[in-house]
């Protein structure tokens, strides 16, 4: 058993049929010695008396808020949560496996630049009685500070019969140099509590590996005389690291109709303009990627050909 | 420690092309190592990230773009002194800081060159003959060093009398390639910045 936060404790249980469970001793936070009784949740049934209560925790029915009283007055609470271990593996029931970039990916993180600011998100089908808390650091043995905000519900989607909820959190490394060469990864830890179930999820990454620039901005077209060709120009996104001559981007320019199966024109360039062939009912799209370290491409910025 | 804005004309900056070749060569070599050594811990997630130049050179700090010198997190206080007469310095106006930056890059290359050559000598003794260093990568390191053209004491190639542990050597190769790729990215960024300034 360990303390998650004040008056909240996590009991780690091997989860299998007829498992013996864990013996837990609760102590009432009071100077009083006599006349103390214990109850669980809303029940008025007295579970025991005395300053300490010993219980055998085997299942979710044994978890919950234990309260010690004296003469009708509440003295203190202890909330017990369960963390299940099945076949040596901690349960991952609360969050959905996003399967990208690999299986068992519960947390996904992205950074728009090298400033040390990043966003992580996760998915669940649970809508109520759910709380998250996020901690992060650079390295684990001698951790350096990363400050994370509160996790918030950022999107709701309908997937078949189920509703899917996306939560996200923003974090900022306390003293980040955009030009630094990372040798210790960022560690992100998410504590998830659903009713009386506790789970924790972690992700470890270098900022350089989770870079995904914003799409290029200010796309403009200029038709070329006596030609089917069009000059398309754009600018670096405002959120990208500066100076741009140091943090350079490379671009992919594509002309395509509405269907992915349609024919297309595609060209890669390090410049902020390119010449392509425009077709009726097609769009010109441009996306960006770090020129020197190939992490993710940005989303497309698009303008119609016409 | 930072790069001033007054730097050579773009046409006068021969190191940019060499640095691009360097990044390409080390990226290809790292990809080849990851494929060939697929049953060894050779991915970014699996290896320890070591920097053999730590406390010996200060390339990131010495080559910091002017715009980032206002960022206190970028101003590390590591002090290192370097020789300052390079041929990539195509303008007499080139500042002392830029010379310091380029000579720090030169020292990095020299250190990695020695490590890679020592390692290759060991790998050539491996009866499995599983992986060797790409001669193109070694040649590209050499070309960039020649373009930088700093006078510097030659570092003797390390020779080891004991029987090499090929498993450890291959893991060290992965660690070295990952670190060198990161440094090559920095070098490429620096050369691009100098070329544009």
């Amino acid at each position: 058993i360990w303390e998650l936060k004040k008056d909240v404790y996590v009991v780690e249980l091997d989860w299998y049929p007829d498992a013996p469970g864990e013996m837990v001793v609760l102590t009432c936070d009071t100077p009083e010695e006599d006349g103390i009784t214990w109850t669980l949740d809303q029940s008025s049934e007295v579970l025991g008396s005395g300053k300490t209560l010993t219980i055998q925790v085997k299942e979710f029915g044994d978890a919950g808020q234990y309260t010690c009283h004296k003469g009708g007055e509440v003295l203190s609470h202890s909330l017990l949560l369960l963390h299940k271990k099945e076949d040596g593996i901690w349960s991952t029931d609360i969050l959905k496996d996003q399967k990208e970039p690999k299986n068992k990916t519960f947390l996904r993180c992205e950074a728009k630049n090298y400033s040390g600011r990043f966003t992580c998100w996760w998915l669940t089908t649970i809508s109520t009685d759910l709380t998250f808390s996020v901690k992060s650091s650079r390295g684990s043995s001698d951790p350096q500070g990363v400050t994370c905000g509160a996790a918030t519900l950022s999107a709701e989607r309908v997937r078949g019969d189920n509703k899917e909820y996306e939560y996200s959190v923003e974090c900022q490394e306390d003293s980040a140099c955009p030009a630094a060469e990372e040798s210790l990864p960022i560690e992100v830890m998410v504590d998830a509590v659903h009713k009386l179930k506790y789970e924790n999820y972690t992700s470890s990454f270098f900022i350089r590996d989770i870079i995904k620039p914003d799409p290029p901005k200010n796309l403009q077209l200029k038709p070329l005389k006596n030609s089917r060709q069009v000059e398309v120009s754009w600018e670096y996104p405002d959120t990208w690291s500066t100076p741009h001559s140091y943090f350079s981007l490379t671009f992919c320019v594509q002309v395509q109709g509405k269907s992915k199966r349609e024919k297309k024109d595609r060209v890669f360039t390090d410049k902020t303009s390119a010449t392509v062939i425009c077709r009726k009912n097609a769009s010109i799209s441009v996306r960006a990627q770090d020129r020197y370290y190939s992490s993710s491409w940005s989303e497309w910025a698009s303008v119609p050909c016409s | 420690r930072n790069l001033p804005v007054a730097t050579p004309d773009p046409g006068m900056f021969p190191c940019l092309h060499h640095s691009q070749n360097l990044l390409r060569a080390v990226s290809n070599m790292l990809q080849k190592a990851r494929q060939t050594l697929e049953f060894y811990p050779c991915t970014s997630e699996e290896i320890d990230h070591e920097d053999i130049t730590k406390d010996k050179t200060s390339t990131v700090e010495a080559c910091l773009p002017l715009e980032l010198t206002k960022n206190e997190s970028c101003l590390n206080s590591r002090e290192t002194s370097f020789i300052t007469n390079g041929s990539c310095l195509a303008s007499r106006k080139t500042s002392f800081m830029m010379a310091l930056c380029l000579s720090s890059i030169y020292e990095d290359l020299k250190m990695y060159q020695v490590e890679f050559k020592t390692m290759n000598a060991k790998l050539l003794m491996d009866p499995k003959r599983q992986i060797f260093l790409d001669q193109n990568m070694l040649a590209v390191i050499d070309e960039l060093m020649q373009a930088l053209n700093f006078n510097s004491e030659t570092v003797p190639q390390k020779s080891s009398l004991e029987e090499p542990d090929f498993y450890k050597t291959k893991i060290k190769l992965c660690i070295l390639l990952h670190a060198f790729r990161i440094r090559a990215v920095t070098i490429d960024r620096v050369m691009s910045y100098l070329n544009a300034s």
């Epitope: 060709q229 199966r261 297309k264 060209v267 360039t269 | -």
Partner: antibody, heavy 118, light 107 residues
Amino acid sequence: QVQLVQSGAEVKKPGSSVKVSCKASGGTFSDYYLHWSRQAPGQGLEWMGWIDPENGDTEYAPKFQGRVTITADESTSTAYMELSSLRSEDTAVYYCARNKELRYFDVWGQGTLVTVSS
Amino acid sequence: DIVMTQSPLSLPVTPGEPASISCRASQSISINLHWYQQKPGQAPRQLIAFASQSISGVPSRFSGSGSGTDFTLTISSLQPEDFATYMCQQSNSFPLTFGQGTKVEIK
């Protein structure tokens, strides 16, 4: 299986014209750009131009502008390349090639030898 | 027009050995570079797209690298069927242009 089948070899006199055909099978004809290139004996490939069979749009290499005409007939899934004012240096194997991507080629025809000789 | 220069023009190689062919562009073309194989009397066959993207059905011994002006096609271990002429082609701008070809011959 996508295939491009070209017409047979031709011998032409200088100053005349030649029209080479390229019939596509497998896949929808108008879903692809169609290009023509040529290869003179012992030389590298030389790109001549492309057509979008869907709308008849064409683009030619400046070297051949005014001398080459590329057309397409959707009903027969056939593209044509006509080269006029032939000279001896036009002796080459002419290839058609196609792709959904405009600027490179994933399937090629077998080639048509055009010999220009007096 | 962008001029594509291949080297060497002829490359004698022992079967089973690796081979590398270089292609240089007269100006920067990013990764807009494609490789083809051509055997005598046959049409070219696509090997690599955009400098390094492998094509389905092409053996994994063929790989491409490079960007900007310098590109390389590598055959890790030459098989008897690989003796042919290899050509690069730039797609950075029209007119599309090809290298003059490198003939890989049996040593």
